[in-house]
Interface confidence: low
């Protein structure tokens, strides 16, 4: 009866430089022995080498010398007693490209190289980019752990070195930015800025990086109202604090623009004397049109800002003066109110 030696392994595998790959493999060999049980040794060799003299790339035989260039990077995974010959290749290098074969040895009777089922390994340039993980969106003032990892990398070979760059990192200790993980407490000004994680394999010229744009949610800030006078000279008044009085001539047309800085954008609404103004008068952008103002249409105008991280409001008093002339003029500023605009 012919002895049966079989090997199941894929013909070819491709891996990017610096990354790792697991090649599944199983084998069978003839073994019948009731009186002795010598150890089972298995080997992976580089093709073209003579098994008896060659250094192996991976083995479970402690007495066999392993190639220094594959030591620790090529490893047998799984239980060889269960006929598992799976090979793990870590920190792949361009010079690893080539053909490999598997060999089994047990006692004097079993010595066999599976030359018909070679594994062809191709190492290509690194195009994989690291992954940057964090819970989104970031919230201003709340510490968030960010982690950078290179998919397909594993612990074999020299360690990966990480470096983070970006404006948001300026308050951090430079040492902190050289770890695969960092804790960032984002600020409003960090919204929209870039954060880059660069990964390099120590001792190798293999570098890859990924850049993400930070989406930082932050509470409303810099709330302001600008008043534009339609038939004026394009002048705008800017109101930054509550309670300011703005005198205006009856018949004037105004645009009130409420602006605020927040992320996500806040919703803006206008109120007059505490009552919400008709949506048809206002726009989504927080602009309110007041055409041809009548004597009774003055009062306290309030822009209210609503946002998941906090609400604010800003008010001013529109004091409508009865018309006595049709000129467009600006009187001198008096007693803490704005000039009279006619």
């Amino acid at each position: 009866e012919k002895p049966v030696y079989e090997l199941q392994v894929q013909k070819s595998v491709t891996v990017q430089e610096g990354l790792c790959v697991l090649v599944p493999c199983s084998f069978s060999y003839p073994w019948r022995s009731w009186y002795s049980s010598p150890p089972l040794y298995v080997y992976w060799f580089r093709d073209g080498e003579i098994p008896y003299y060659a250094e192996v790339v991976a083995t479970n035989n402690p007495d066999r010398r392993v190639k220094p260039e594959t030591q620790g990077r090529f490893r047998l995974l799984g239980d060889v007693q269960k006929k598992n010959c799976s090979l793990s290749i870590g920190d792949a290098r361009m010079e690893d490209t080539g053909s490999y074969f598997f060999r089994v040895e047990r006692g004097r009777d079993v010595k066999y190289s599976y030359q018909q089922n070679k594994l062809n390994l191709e190492v290509t340039a690194l195009i994989e980019k690291p992954d940057i993980h964090f819970l989104e969106p970031l919230e201003s003032g709340r510490p968030t752990r960010l982690s950078c990892s290179l998919p397909g990398s594993c612990e074999a070979g020299p360690p990966l070195t990480f470096s983070w760059t970006g404006n948001a990192l300026s308050p951090l200790d430079p040492e902190t930015t050289r770890s695969s993980e960092l804790t960032l407490t984002p600020r409003p000004e960090d919204h929209g800025t870039n954060l880059t994680c660069q990964v390099k394999r120590q001792g190798a010229q293999v570098t890859t990086e990924r850049t993400v744009q930070l989406n930082v949610s932050y509470a409303p800030q810099n709330l302001a109202i600008s008043i534009f006078f339609r038939n004026g000279t394009g002048t705008a008044l800017r109101i930054l604090s509550n309670g300011m009085s703005v005198p205006i001539q009856e018949g004037q047309s105004l645009f009130l623009a409420c602006t605020v800085d927040s992320n996500p954008p806040a919703s803006l609404s206008w109120f007059r004397e505490g009552k919400a103004l008709n949506p048809s008068q206002t726009s989504m952008s927080g602009t309110l049109e007041l055409p041809n103002i009548g004597a009774r249409e003055g009062g306290e105008f309030t822009c209210r800002v609503q946002h998941p991280l906090g609400s604010q409001h800003l008010s001013f008093i529109l004091s409508v003066q009865r018309s006595s002339s049709s000129c467009i003029c600006v009187t001198e500023k008096q007693q803490g109110s704005w000039p009279l605009l006619t």
């Epitope: 819970l135 989104e136 969106p137 919230e139 003032g141 709340r142 510490p143 752990r145 951090l172 200790d173 902190t176 960092l182 804790t183 960032l184 407490t185 949610s217 998941p308 991280l309």
Partner: antibody, heavy 119, light 112 residues
Framework: QVQLQQSGAELVKPGASVKLSCKAS????????IHWVKQRSGQGLEWIGW????????KYNEKFKDKATLTADKSSSTVYMELSRLTSEDSAVYFC????????????WGQGTTLTVSS | DVLMTQTPLSLLVSLGDQASISCRSS???????????LEWYLQKPGQSPKLLIY???IRFSGVPDRFSGSGSGTDFTLKISRVEAEDLGVYYC?????????FGGGTKLEIK
């Protein structure tokens, strides 16, 4: 096992300052946030702020911003809270508590430090 | 600040009965990352508080399954299905979604 050991009870005069300590053991100090919580006699709990030893990040409850100062000594895995310009309102039990970054809550607490402010 | 209002202030229950504590927040406590950081703590007399529930409904390790949390948005509930003697103490709800983080006023559970 995880432990947060707080310093002993303090009796101090109004206007003075005091520094309470919270020594962590049984886990990697830099991987968890330490929080401080105030409890006045027979009353509820008030969050004071956090200190994250991993990055030195600090966040205060605005109410305690001018009252409490949080610091840490990584070499001894200890977080400190200094309370200044003490008044009788500061008399309370102060707890430190550990929180996992993933939002699991305050999973371990110190035994509390009783602060009495009295002339 | 987010105000956490607990009801009732105190609860008198017989051993084996069910107890229910309500906690209402003055605004939504859904964090911008989508999580709701609502927790429940029990403080027994003379002890530090202990974590029971986090993220609304997840029981902390070692907490008996008679404790359950539920709710969303602004309304949350802690239920104890069969009250035991060791459950007495003050229960606090807590939100960790918006700074400053805030506790509820507490609910005192007493045994009849």
């Amino acid at each position: 096992q995880v432990q947060l050991q707080q310093s002993g009870a303090e009796l101090v005069k109004p206007g003075a300052s005091v520094k309470l300590s919270c020594k962590a053991s049984g886990y990697t100090f830099t991987e968890y946030t330490i929080h401080w919580v105030k409890q006045r006699s027979g009353q509820g709990l008030e969050w004071i702020g956090w200190f994250y030893p991993g990055s030195g990040s600090i966040k205060y409850n605005e109410k305690f911003k001018d009252k409490a100062t949080l610091t840490a000594d990584k070499s001894s895995s200890t977080v400190y809270m200094e309370l200044s310009r003490l008044t009788s309102e500061d008399s309370a039990v102060y707890f430190c508590a550990r929180q996992e970054e993933g939002g699991i809550g305050f999973d371990y607490w110190g035994q509390g430090t009783t602060l009495t402010v009295s002339s | 600040d987010v105000l956490m209002t607990q009801t009732p202030l105190s609860l008198l229950v017989s051993l084996g009965d069910q107890a229910s504590i309500s906690c209402r927040s003055s605004q939504s406590i859904v964090h911008s990352n989508g999580n709701t950081y609502l927790e429940w703590y029990l403080q027994k007399p003379g002890q530090s508080p202990k974590l029971l529930i986090y993220k609304v409904s997840i029981r902390f390790s070692g907490v008996p399954d008679r404790f359950s949390g539920s709710g969303s948005g602004t309304d949350f509930t802690l239920k104890i299905s069969r009250v035991e003697a060791e459950d007495l103490g003050v229960y606090y709800c807590f939100q960790g979604s918006h700074v400053p983080w805030t506790f509820g006023g507490g609910t005192k559970l007493e045994i009849k």
